[in-house]
């Protein structure tokens, strides 16, 4: 019989229900925005905005200062007071729409839904390792702003993204706002604009450059700005918007908008469609050819990548990559594939595609039918013509006008659909050693820290834990402070170590010591932990073998048994070759001699499952007693593996030595031709791994084996005669003298 060790699911080596408590702060209301500051002199702060209030926290998440930002018209509103005596507009709550740092000053800028979306500038005042906010400056000049032209109206109640860029001595605010007809009619915010902060902090310079959704499209064409960032020579906005101005407005797709970070102008404003798909390895019948589209971006983050992912993406280590979490639609409801997919877009490739698109539009002769696009911002036109014009005048350049690149940038899910039902709501990517880690928040209030790799059919978790008991969604915006990430969920801010919250979710020594170096995991006798959790017994260099099962569970006291041991950390080498003298197995007092691994039986084990097998030949000593005993595996002097060496002993109870007894055999005669069905009755007849019924030295073919009974078919006899019949278990004869009589057929 060929017994095989049962597979242990990979998931059995970890427990994602382990509770981790990370530092947190209760903000007293739904967190609307959050940003962190790290100064040159070790001072740092976390700024957390809720409705009508702005909290300043120290690096330990303890409250340092709190500022009332609303309601507008309320005498207690501290920011409103900075604008002088009112009224400044209709009263109402202030929901923070923008919270950014101006690194040049340094200062914090907050903009809310009240007071025409104006902003306030708070200079940062370091006090030891903490930071305080100076009295706010109102970034609004009443005489400069009109309902139809308002350089100081920044935030839209429908959402605004801001990236601040230093150019020379000035700070430029790259602003993208969602609009509708009602918002557009009220102090005219723009869709995309670049505004220079005035040196006297009295607001933004007039005459700023801007693009806005044309009035005729405002009702049906809404743009959601999901993320903005600055890298290299450009500022990028990521949007979700209708795929067409003319078609169904609910058919959405994702675009990247690129603006120059060195020139505060919009002539070189470019857009590119980002296409993220789930392409399963085995395509279902009826599934779309290029994979299932996930057109709607939920969250995004850009970061330099580690060596392994860089190789997989065919780029250089440390190059900036834009990562996006995409869903199938606005509701992100379940489709055929996973709920969320993650696509990676190398920034250099994005830039190349955009630049190629510009060349295609502006070359001579131009490909016929190429459109400039962006018909929601500008009059329709064909390349190379400027918007709304039939031809290019000699002194204007085709390049100096906004353009939608005609080709899209297509990528497939990095996780191959393995996020499954998880709905990702927050994303931050970091590079740790040469590993790229995605830190993801989920709809049900969990944090997933997963290595970003393409080539696997399982997820490599750093951690997967619940932030708290509320189960509220983790919010989109994540901030970094030192070696921690700050996630918001409901009314709380949580501080999660980039290296993971701990190691207790790794249940086995092998899984523990295979964890990434940056996690700092070590084995503490019977649990995985960081050194500070168990300084006494903590070590990172070896694991004992672990016996989980063996077969058979009993063997004869006389005769040999082929014993198969199951478990982990037997070899550390896929070949399973055992150096001489390293593995010692004892069953009770008896040694079990290691058997060479049968290479024909070697089966590839998928990484999702793991099990190791070890076989040995058990020959009980003469002193061995009948009855239950332990199986013990000791491994010593093993050469070290990639992560650790195997060293130690594992003991498992449950083996029994038994003495088979043969009580009766019937019938005691049969035809010389053979084929008589013999029944042998007794006790412990099924022990061990081998047994044989011999009729005159020839094997009687076993048909059934049980503890109390053996059935076999007699072989043909040479002559009519009485011949000896015997039973061997494990190669040793069971006591008793029996004969079988061959008769004429």
């Amino acid at each position: 019989e060929d017994w095989q060790c049962p597979r242990t699911p990979y998931a059995a080596s970890r427990d994602f229900d382990v509770k981790y408590v990370v530092p947190s702060f209760s903000a007293g209301g739904l967190v609307q925005a959050m940003v962190t500051y790290e100064g040159d002199r070790n001072e740092s702060a976390v700024f957390v905005a809720i409705r009508n209030r702005l909290h300043v926290l120290g690096p330990d998440l303890k409250s340092v200062q709190s500022l009332a930002t609303g309601p507008a018209g309320d005498p207690g509103c501290q920011t409103c007071a900075a604008c002088g005596p009112g009224p400044h507009g209709p009263p109402g709550d202030t929901d923070t729409k923008v919270l950014v740092l101006d690194p040049a000053l340094p200062a914090l800028v907050s903009c809310g839904s009240s007071l025409q979306g104006r902003c306030f500038l708070h200079d940062l005042e370091p006090q030891g390792t903490a930071v305080h906010l100076a009295a706010p400056a109102c970034l609004f000049s009443a005489h400069h702003n009109r309902p139809d032209d308002c350089p100081d109206c920044v935030a839209s109640p429908l959402g605004t993204r801001v990236t601040v860029v230093e150019q020379g001595q000035a700070s430029y605010f790259y602003v993208a706002s969602s609009l509708d007809a009602a918002v557009a009619a009220s102090f005219s915010p723009r869709s995309v604009s670049i505004r220079r902060l005035k040196a006297d902090a009295s607001g933004f310079a007039p005459g700023f450059v801007a693009l806005s959704v044309l009035p005729k499209h405002l009702v049906s064409y809404s743009i959601e700005y999901v993320h903005s960032f600055h890298t290299g020579a450009f500022v990028y906005f990521l949007t979700v918007q209708p795929a067409s101005v003319t078609d169904d407005p609910s058919a959405l797709h994702t675009r990247l908008a690129r603006l120059s970070a060195t020139e505060p102008e919009l002539g070189d404003y470019r857009e590119l469609v980002l296409d993220c798909r789930f392409a399963p390895k085995r395509r279902r019948r009826g599934a779309p050819e290029g994979g299932q589209p996930y057109p709607v971006l939920r969250v995004a983050h850009s970061a330099p990548v580690g060596a392994q992912l860089a190789t997989e993406l065919s780029i250089a280590e440390g190059q900036e990559v834009l990562f996006g979490v995409f869903v199938t639609g606005k509701d992100g409801g379940p489709g055929v594939g996973p709920n969320s997919v993650v696509c990676a877009f190398p920034i250099d490739l994005l830039d190349t595609l955009i630049d190629e698109g510009v060349e295609r539009c502006c070359e001579s002769p131009v490909h016929p039918g190429l459109r400039r696009g962006l018909d929601f911002f500008q009059s329709p036109s064909f390349c190379p013509n400027p918007p709304g014009l039939e031809a290019l005048s000699p002194n204007t350049s085709c390049r100096h006008f906004p353009l939608l690149v005609s080709s899209s940038f297509s990528r497939v899910d990095l996780f191959n659909g393995l996020l499954g039902p998880v709905q990702v709501t927050a994303l931050y990517v970091t590079r740790l050693d040469n590993v790229t880690v995605a830190h993801m928040g989920t709809m049900d209030g969990r944090i997933l820290q997963v290595e970003l790799v393409r080539s696997l059919n399982y997820l490599l978790y750093v951690s997967n834990f619940s932030l708290g008991d509320s189960g509220q969604p983790v919010q989109r915006d994540v901030s970094r402070l030192g070696d921690h990430l700050l996630f918001a969920s409901g009314d709380q801010v949580f501080q999660v170590p980039i290296q993971g919250p701990g190691c207790r979710h790794f249940l086995t020594c092998g899984r523990c010591l295979r964890a990434w170096h940056f996690m700092g995991c070590g084995w503490c006798g019977n649990m995985c932990g960081q050194q500070k959790e168990c300084p006494g017994s903590w070590q990172q260099d070896h694991c004992p073998p672990k016996l989980t099962e063996f077969h058979p569970h009993s063997g004869p006291l006389r005769g040999s048994t082929r014993l198969t041991l199951c478990g982990s950390n037997f070899y550390l080498h896929p070949s399973g070759l055992v150096p001489e003298g390293t593995h010692q197995v004892t069953v009770g007092q008896s040694p079990c001699r290691p058997l060479p691994k049968d290479s024909s039986k070697l089966r590839p084990v998928p990484r999702k499952d793991f099990v190791e097998e070890f076989e040995c030949e058990l020959e009980p000593l003469g002193t061995q007693a009948v009855g239950p005993t332990n199986v013990s595996l000791t491994v010593t002097n093993m050469p070290p593996g990639k992560h650790f060496r195997v060293d130690g002993t594992s003991v498992l109870r449950g083996f029994s030595f038994m003495e088979p007894v043969l009580i009766a055999v019937q019938p005691l005669f049969g035809p010389r031709a053979g084929g008589t069905c013999l029944t042998l009755e007794g006790q412990s007849l099924s022990v061990g791994t081998s047994r044989a019924v011999l009729v005159n030295g020839t094997e009687c073919l076993l048909a059934r084996v049980s503890e109390g009974q053996l059935l076999c078919a007699t072989p043909p006899g040479a002559t009519v005669a009485s011949v000896p019949l015997s039973l061997q278990v494990g190669g040793a004869q069971v006591p008793g003298s029996w004969t079988f009589q061959y008769r004429e057929d």
């Epitope: 190349t352 630049d355 190629e356 060349e359 295609r360 502006c362 070359e363 001579s364 002769p365 490909h367 016929p368 000699p394 350049s397 085709c398 390049r399």
Partner: antibody, heavy 116, light 107 residues
Framework: EVQLLESGGGLVQPGGSLRLSCAAS????????MGWVRQAPGKGLEWVSS????????YYADSVKGRFTISRDNSKNTLYLQMNSLRAEDTAVYYC?????????WGQGTLVTVSS | DIQMTQSPSSVSASVGDRVTITCRAS??????LAWYQQKPGKAPKLLIY???SLQSGVPSRFSGSGSGTDFTLTISSLQPEDFATYYC?????????FGQGTKVEIK
């Protein structure tokens, strides 16, 4: 009239260097991508290199990568091809041409002969 | 790299004949294809771009068709000045690659 005029070709020994120039006139040079295409005697056309309008991005054929450098001076309306470590198989007429996707117009070409 | 294969490598024809030259790309290039004419000792001249668009100043007897991987240049009625070598070139991606050329000779 749009015109391109190459110069700088000649006889050079293997391992030697040569710099080709292409003077452009009749159009706004700084608005266009430019490139070099070569043709070995009795053979077909082979694209060599292209450069963006600003000079900010360049492309090369594998056969010349690391040996040839394309550049431009928009103030002088001139395109250049610096050729180092020349080999016998680089012998060809080198044309400068305007364009990104397709090439139009072309210069009259300059002959580069690599021989010992 | 995208390989461009032209056929035939040469064709003998008379004035007034209809001549067809084909070009096959090793992978799809949409309509990013150009055709050039080159006469001995002269620089190439752009005839067709975007697979089927006639460059200004080129006689209408030249036409191009095709999309994806298979393209055709047709001269509807061969004129004496049309005896030359014709090249296709893909513009879908870098490196730009040319076909090996088709020589149109007098019969």
């Amino acid at each position: 009239e749009v015109q391109l005029l190459e110069s700088g070709g000649g006889l050079v020994q293997p391992g030697g260097s040569l710099r080709l120039s292409c003077a452009a006139s009749g159009f706004t040079f700084s608005n266009y991508m430019m490139g070099w295409v070569r043709q070995a005697p009795g053979k077909g056309l082979e694209w060599v290199s292209s450069i963006y309008f600003s000079g900010g991005k360049t492309y090369y054929a594998d056969s010349v990568k690391g040996r040839f450098t394309i550049s431009r001076d928009n103030s002088k309306n001139t395109l250049y091809l610096q050729m180092n470590s020349l080999r016998a198989e680089d012998t060809a007429v080198y044309y400068c041409a305007r364009g990104y996707s397709w090439f139009d117009p072309w210069g009259q070409g300059t002959l580069v002969t690599v021989s010992s | 790299d995208i390989q461009m294969t032209q056929s035939p490598s040469s064709v003998s024809a008379s004035v007034g004949d209809r001549v067809t030259i084909t070009c096959r790309a090793s992978q799809g290039i949409s309509s990013w294809l150009a055709w050039y004419q080159q006469k001995p000792g002269k620089a190439p001249k752009l005839l067709i771009y975007a697979a089927s668009s006639l460059q200004s100043g080129v006689p209408s007897r030249f036409s191009g068709s095709g999309s994806g991987t298979d393209f055709t240049l047709t001269i509807s009625s061969l004129q004496p000045e049309d005896f030359a070598t014709y090249y296709c070139q893909q513009a879908n991606s870098f490196p730009r690659t040319f076909g090996q050329g088709t020589k149109v000779e007098i019969k």
